[in-house]
């Protein structure tokens, strides 16, 4: 017999998901309008075209890059698109009833929409840690509670250390990464004898999940330019970060290759590093003043990468439960972290000329705001993994992790794969 | 020549509604960030909103959100402050000023390099 | 908040300091801008970055920072200097400047 949904999910996913809908909906009613001032149409195309990079990013590239499990990827695909949907419009009311409020109605633009797709981002990143091992309905949960964690975040860095919003969004990296890994440290670990081909990739998903790397590739010199604020800065955000990620790929592929007895590249080496450039230079991307610059960063992230991608999945599979494949939780906490500190580098030798004897204080600063960010992903991870273990959720059984049968109708399958 | 000029200002009702308009010349408007600014009788100035260079992003101060949209027309160069609502305390000279970005070490810095002459808006009954 | 005094004098030829101050977030990692604004005419950039003078600006204005304090000297006072002062740094979580309370500078 192919495997059945459980019976409880079945009545819980579609009741839990619509009635949650159906709030939004009402929320949405109550309390949003369109932004009536669209003079120049022009300009609103130009605007929408960054949205539509960051949706096929969000989509399309982290999609498909989570998608190379033997028999999971259509869960992946669709289980993304699922939580972008959902994020994006629960994204869209929290960061208005942050910042808008007192106004009484929260104001729909392009950049809302954009600030959004960026937040739901986040939740992509870090279920990369945990696909495979939740259903629907635990999604759902995780969706709701680390979107509400980023955009308080957000709104705390804003107030508090008065960053603009791409220097507080730019924390994205180090807070997905670091809130997937705790929720997954929650999560059941081990893998019971005989599934264990489940985790493996398999060659048809794994192309697939090279078409993912190849989208996020072309799209994130958009991502790390979306909410600059001058187009000074925006081409200085573009081009340091293609310079970035074209010599990220060359490392990575290279370095794969390097790190391998016979010389062979892996396949998920490559999907993870080459977007390792992207991701180091994200804080400093528009303030890099020459391509020498990123592109040497570029080669640093690729060699972290791959570094990374050769000795840490032993630690994180006995750890935290990650297969081997699930690499964008480390790698994105280690390349975030290194451009966290290329910041605070940038922010030494700024701070020496913009009045004297606030260096420490500068440096403690941004070390206070990236701290706050771990320690809140760390906290609202862990958080989401007990809410996530509760019998409600019906979890499915170890010994259907990362099973595309337990989720989808295939009407040409009468047992197993 | 690089210029701003205002105009739209002029005496409303409590509760009555203005649309301020500022023309740019001498520069191209959609590279820059604007700005509107007033200065109240008797009191300092104050900074109203700003609307970025794409016109994607807009903000105000927290006494006019829900009543001002500031928005632009980059093909005719202009840019705007649509003004409902008004209360007697919005009587003031309004300021269109346009947003310069220089870059540093670990941030860009922006102020307001260029201002209008300013139109001024009466609340009155 | 940006406070500054709200008045200040002197005589002709004379040198006047104004003063600026606030939070570390506001004023401690960001640089300072001072503009004039004339009786009936729009405010002029006076001062950027801290201490530059944008071209058109005599040199007898200067401007200085420290820590969370910045200052405005106007050296060889004349009676055209009369006018309001204000020291503006960028707030990045507003999206604008934030304009200190000005300074009333009277040229006896």
């Known amino acids: 017999m192919s495997s059945k949904y459980p019976r409880s999910v079945r009545r819980c996913l579609p009741l839990w998901a619509l009635t949650l809908e159906a709030a939004l909906i009402l929320l949405f009613y109550f309390f949003t309008h369109y932004d009536a001032s669209l003079e120049d149409q022009k300009g609103l195309v130009a605007s929408y075209q960054v949205g539509q990079d960051l949706t096929v990013m969000a989509a399309i590239g982290l999609g498909f890059l989570t998608s190379s499990f033997r028999r999971h990827s259509w869960s992946s695909v669709a289980f993304n698109l699922f939580m972008l949907a959902l994020g994006v419009q629960w994204a869209i009311l929290l960061d208005g009833f942050l910042s808008q409020f007192p106004s009484g109605k929260v104001v729909i633009t392009l950049f809302s929409i954009r600030l959004a797709t960026m937040s739901a981002l986040s939740v992509l990143i870090s279920v990369d840690a945990v696909l495979g091992k939740v259903n629907l309905a635990q999604l759902v949960v995780m969706v709701l509670v680390e979107v509400t964690a980023l955009g308080n975040l957000r709104m705390v860095i804003s107030n508090i250390f008065n960053t603009d919003y791409h220097m507080n969004m730019m924390h994205i990296y180090v807070f997905a990464a670091y809130f997937g890994l705790s929720v997954a440290w929650c999560l059941p670990k081990p893998l019971p004898e005989g599934t264990e081909d489940k985790d493996q990739t398999a060659t048809i998903p794994s192309l697939s999940a090279m078409l993912g790397a190849l989208f996020l590739w072309m799209f994130w010199p958009s991502f790390n330019s979306a909410l600059l604020r001058s187009p000074i800065e925006r081409k200085n955000a573009v081009f340091n970060t293609y310079y970035a990620v074209a010599v990220s790929v060359v490392t990575a592929i290279s370095g794969s290759s390097l790190a391998h007895p016979q010389g062979k590249i892996s396949k998920t080496y490559v999907h993870s590093a080459v977007l390792a450039g992207g991701v180091a230079v994200g804080t400093s991307c528009h303030l890099i003043p020459s391509p020498w610059l990123a592109m040497v960063l570029g080669l640093v992230a690729g060699l972290i990468s791959v570094g990374g991608a050769k000795y840490l999945p032993g630690c994180c599979n006995r750890v935290l439960g990650i297969p081997h494949s699930s690499i964008m939780g480390y790698n994105f906490s280690l390349l975030g972290l290194l451009g966290e500190i290329i910041y605070i580098v940038l922010l030494v030798l700024d701070t020496v000329g913009a009045g004297n004897g606030m260096i420490g204080f500068q440096v403690l600063l941004s070390i206070g705001e990236l701290s706050l960010a771990i320690v809140i992903a760390l906290m609202s991870g862990l958080l989401t993994g007990l809410l996530l273990n509760l019998k409600i959720w019906k979890a499915p059984h170890e010994a259907k992790y990362f099973d595309d049968q337990v989720f989808w109708k295939f009407p040409h399958l009468a047992v197993g794969f | 020549q690089v210029k701003l000029l205002e105009s739209g200002g002029g005496v409303v009702q409590p509760g009555g509604s203005l649309r301020l308009s500022c023309v740019a010349s001498g520069f191209t408007l959609r590279s820059y960030g604007m700005h509107w600014v007033r200065q109240a009788p008797g009191k300092g100035l104050e900074w109203v909103a700003f609307i970025w260079f794409d016109g994607s992003n807009k903000g105000y101060v927290d006494s006019v959100k829900g009543r001002f949209t500031i928005s632009r027309d980059n093909s005719k160069n202009m840019v705007y402050l649509q003004m409902n609502s008004l209360r007697a305390d919005d009587t003031a000279v309004y300021y269109c000023?346009?947003?310069?970005?220089?870059?540093?070490?670990?941030?860009?810095?922006?102020?307001?390099?260029?201002w209008g002459k300013g139109t001024t808006v009466t609340v009155s009954s | 908040v940006v406070t500054q005094p709200p008045s200040a004098s002197g005589t002709p030829g004379q040198r006047v300091t104004i003063s600026c101050s606030g939070s570390?977030?506001?004023?401690?990692?960001?640089?300072v801008y001072w503009y004039q604004k004339l009786p009936g005419t729009a405010p002029k950039l006076l001062i950027y970055k801290n201490d530059q003078r944008p071209s058109g600006v005599s040199d007898r204005f200067s401007g200085s920072k420290s820590g969370t304090s910045a200052s405005l000297a106007i050296s060889g006072l004349r009676s055209e200097d009369e006018a309001d002062y204000y020291c503006a740094p960028w707030d990045a979580n507003l999206g604008g400047p934030v304009f200190g309370g000005g300074t009333k500078l009277t040229v006896l």
């Open positions: 000023a346009r947003e310069k970005a220089l870059r540093g070490i670990s941030r860009y810095n922006y102020y307001l390099d260029v």
């Open positions: 570390n977030s506001i004023l401690g990692s960001k640089y």
